[in-house]
């Protein structure tokens, strides 16, 4: 039995990768900053967990996807007030018991130092300094990402 | 080049429904968020409300109840309604590109709501 | 009543530097470092001329600068030409989703 936020996460990745092939992205798009090989977008307003991974694939992006401790370092290196939260692509899956990114992976227990419970609508956000889970449904913001590729690319689903 | 064109009755009458059509050219509906802003003659600038193109909204305090925003991402327009309008709606409406939810980087000209019997 | 404060106008004369000023509170201004600032000529749509405080866009001449302190922002324009006679509007986010607007300043060339 999925949860409505695994659905929805579901859902919009699965609507995204009905087309195969798009034309690779060689600079960020205005008002997004680019980290590596991605293109960032950190919201300005605040929206529930759902609504911030709905935006995000409206705007052909996905809610934030960290591979490793030092992604995560660089991202929270952006932000430029440690009172801020920003959600990411990482929620809680009841019917697995594990936290889940968006494309469908499970967290390496190892990559994130997480603060608080993990336990069903449980979402996953970042601070300047910290990892927090909080409620799906709390207002914050979050943070966009667009993958930079300069050649034609498979779309996947964490792209 | 990003353009945005406004367009609606000129004029309406005390309780009815004020309703106004943004078209956006150059720029895709989809990646940005979009807005009403209003200027009564002679004075300031008012944030009426903002549409995502998830579909949600987010309305001005003071006229959240009268508010209804929509958007047609396929003839990349979005539009307001304003129901049970007064006098005091009588104002020149302007939409507008909201990238981030925060501040507004082009502009339709604007076109005049007069509200009155 | 506008949310944020400004003067109704200032002027100067061509090649000085003008500085006009926006307060708010701490929900508002204060709060957050997303000031921006329109210029609007009469009878034309508001031009954003700054944003994030400081920011500005492409096109916007460098004479145009923002700042902020605490619960006031401020646009100095430098080097005034007679182009720059026009109204401007401060503008900040103010909290859960909302934007306010300021009253406006008449800037007039001399």
């Known amino acids: 039995q999925k949860s409505s936020i695994e659905k929805c996460s579901v859902d919009i990745q699965q609507s995204r990768n009905k087309t195969t092939e798009r034309p690779g992205l060689l600079n960020c798009p205005i008002y997004w900053q680019q980290l590596r090989e991605k293109c960032l977008l950190f919201s300005h307003t605040v929206n529930p967990w759902n609504n911030s991974l709905a935006d995000c694939s409206t705007k052909e992006s996905s809610l934030l996807l960290i591979r490793d401790k030092d992604e995560l370092i660089h991202t929270q290196n952006l932000i430029r007030d440690k009172a801020i939260l920003f959600w990411i692509g990482l929620n809680f899956s009841l019917s697995e018991k594990n936290w889940k990114w968006i494309n469908g992976s499970f967290l390496n227990s190892n990559d994130l130092e997480i603060r608080g419970d993990a336990k069903e609508n449980s979402c996953i956000s970042i601070s300047q300094t910290s990892v927090y889970s909080e409620y799906c449904s709390t207002e914050i913001r979050w943070i966009c990402q667009k993958e930079l590729t300069p050649v034609r690319n498979k779309v996947y689903p964490d792209s | 080049q990003v353009q945005l064109q406004e367009s609606g009755p000129g004029l309406v009458k005390p309780s009815e429904t004020l309703s106004l059509t943004c078209t956006v050219s150059?720029?895709?509906?989809?990646?940005?968020?979009w807005s009403w802003i209003r200027q009564p003659a002679g004075k300031g600038l008012e944030w009426i409300g903002r549409?995502?193109?998830?579909?949600?909204?987010n309305y001005n305090p003071s006229l959240k109840s009268r508010l209804t925003m929509s958007l047609d991402t396929s003839k990349n327009q979005f539009s307001l309604r304003l129901s049970s309008v007064t006098a005091a709606d009588t104002a020149v409406y302007y939409c507008?590109?909201?990238?981030?939810?925060?501040?507004?980087?082009?502009w339709g000209q604007g076109t005049l709501v007069t509200v009155s019997s | 009543q506008s949310a944020l404060t400004q003067p109704p106008s200032a002027s100067g004369s061509p090649g000085q530097s003008v500085t006009i000023s926006c307060t708010g509170t701490?929900?508002?201004?204060?709060?957050?470092?997303?000031v921006s600032w329109y210029q609007q000529h009469p009878g034309k749509a508001p031009k954003l001329m700054i944003y994030?405080?400081?920011k500005r866009p492409s096109g916007v001449p460098d004479r145009f600068s923002g700042s902020k302190s605490g619960n006031t922002a401020s646009l100095t324009v430098s080097g005034l030409q007679a182009e720059d006679e026009a109204d401007y509007y401060c503008?900040?986010?103010?909290?859960?989703?909302?934007?306010?607007f300021g009253g406006g300043t008449k800037l007039t060339v001399l």
């Open positions: 994030e405080v400081s």
């Open positions: 549409i995502y193109t998830s579909g949600s909204t």
């Open positions: 507008a590109r909201d990238p981030l939810g925060t501040f507004f980087d082009y």
């Open positions: 503008s900040s986010y103010a909290g859960i989703n909302n934007v306010v």
């Open positions: 150059g720029s895709s509906i989809s990646f940005y968020y």
């Open positions: 701490s929900s508002d201004v204060g709060g957050y470092n997303y």
